[in-house]
């Protein structure tokens, strides 16, 4: 937490070595919160489409506990479309991010809650 | 190792234009987001806000919107901090400082001063 | 915003003393299990050292005399004990949210 998810039909041999690595530094930087607290999840390969087309493109989550808001939105989907079209090659007019904002007592972990 | 280096010390009128530099070396300058930090004559320190140096995307502090501006050029690893339409009370000490991931300030460059004066 | 005490303003101690600067906010800056609290020194000229980040993490380099302790809204700077290259002034700050800020500072006299 904060945890981002990306779907995508992007086949495997297409996501670089690195790009995990790079959007938890990216993610880290955007939230303010330390690495060890964020999770990335890419789901590469997945039968999808975008306006009726299968041409690259990413249905993604960002949860986080705080940090989720109209201005803050933003900045983050120019952060991760930017990301996922650098890196994947998904036009950013291809990629729906939805944001969760989370009540820390409803995020488990470490045998207990963040509450 | 890793170093921000800040452009000199400023003399400067009111209404005019100062553009600061903060060269960054010694690490991937696009992982760290980079902050402005003021500090009048023996006052205390004032985040002034910060730039993702990912997007170039600014944020200020509500007391340094309007004639304030942060900016990049990541090919040479330097945020910039300009100030329009100076007036006195922006005489200080501007400080340069890379957040670490929690946002707190590792590295500081070593300040400009800044003097506005007729 | 989030506003930091610091108290005292001023403090004078004989060598080998133990300096105890208190920081307060006026709201949590606790989540995700850490304590977004950070100290910093200053010297007359020269800029801020990260000190403690985190509450209690004690930055590469930095004397283990400094240390850092507390949580929510009430964090400790201990110096023990202080030496005479510890005369500056000490920064708390916050980063839990923006605008990230700063303590009015505590300014340390070596007597």
């Known amino acids: 937490m904060p945890m981002f998810i990306v779907n995508t039909n992007v086949p495997r041999a297409s996501v670089p070595d690195g790009f995990l690595s790079e959007l938890t530094q990216q993610l880290a930087q955007a939230t303010g919160k330390p690495p060890q607290y964020i999770a990335v999840h890419v789901v590469p390969d997945q039968l999808m489409a975008f306006g009726g087309s299968s041409e690259p493109c990413a249905l993604c989550s960002l949860h986080s506990i705080g940090k989720i808001g109209g201005a803050q939105n933003r900045s983050y989907s120019k952060l991760l479309c930017g990301l996922l079209a650098e890196r994947l090659r998904i036009s950013p007019d291809r990629v729906y991010i939805n944001y969760y904002d989370m009540n820390a007592a409803n995020v488990g972990w470490n045998n207990s809650t963040f509450a | 190792q890793i170093q921000l280096v800040q452009s000199g010390p400023e003399l400067k009128k009111p209404g005019e234009t100062v553009k600061i530099s903060c060269k960054a070396s010694g690490y991937s300058f696009r992982n760290y987001g980079m902050n402005w930090v003021s500090q009048p004559p023996g006052k205390g320190l004032e985040w002034m806000g910060w730039?993702?140096?990912?997007?170039?995307?600014?944020t200020y502090a509500d007391d340094f919107k309007g004639r304030f501006a942060f900016s990049l050029d990541t090919s040479a690893s330097t945020a910039y901090l300009t100030i329009n339409n100076l007036k006195n009370e922006d005489t200080a000490t501007y400080f340069c400082a890379r957040s670490n991931y929690g946002n707190y300030f590792d590295y500081w460059g070593q300040g400009t001063t800044l003097t506005v004066s007729a | 915003n989030i506003v930091l005490t610091q108290s005292p303003a001023s403090l004078a101690l004989s060598l080998g003393q133990r300096a105890t600067i208190s920081c307060r906010t006026s709201e949590s800056v606790d989540s995700y299990a850490s304590s977004f609290m950070h100290w910093y020194q200053q010297k007359p000229g020269q800029s801020p050292k990260l000190l403690i980040y985190l509450a209690s993490n004690l930055e590469s380099g930095v004397p283990a005399r400094f240390s850092g302790s507390g949580s929510r809204t009430d964090f400790t700077l201990t110096i023990d004990p202080v030496e005479a290259d510890d005369a500056a002034t000490y920064y708390c700050?916050?980063?839990?949210?923006?605008?990230?800020?700063f303590g009015g500072g505590t300014q340390l006299e070596i007597k």
């Open positions: 700050q916050q980063s839990n949210e923006d605008p990230r800020t």
């Open positions: 730039i993702n140096t990912y997007t170039g995307e600014p």
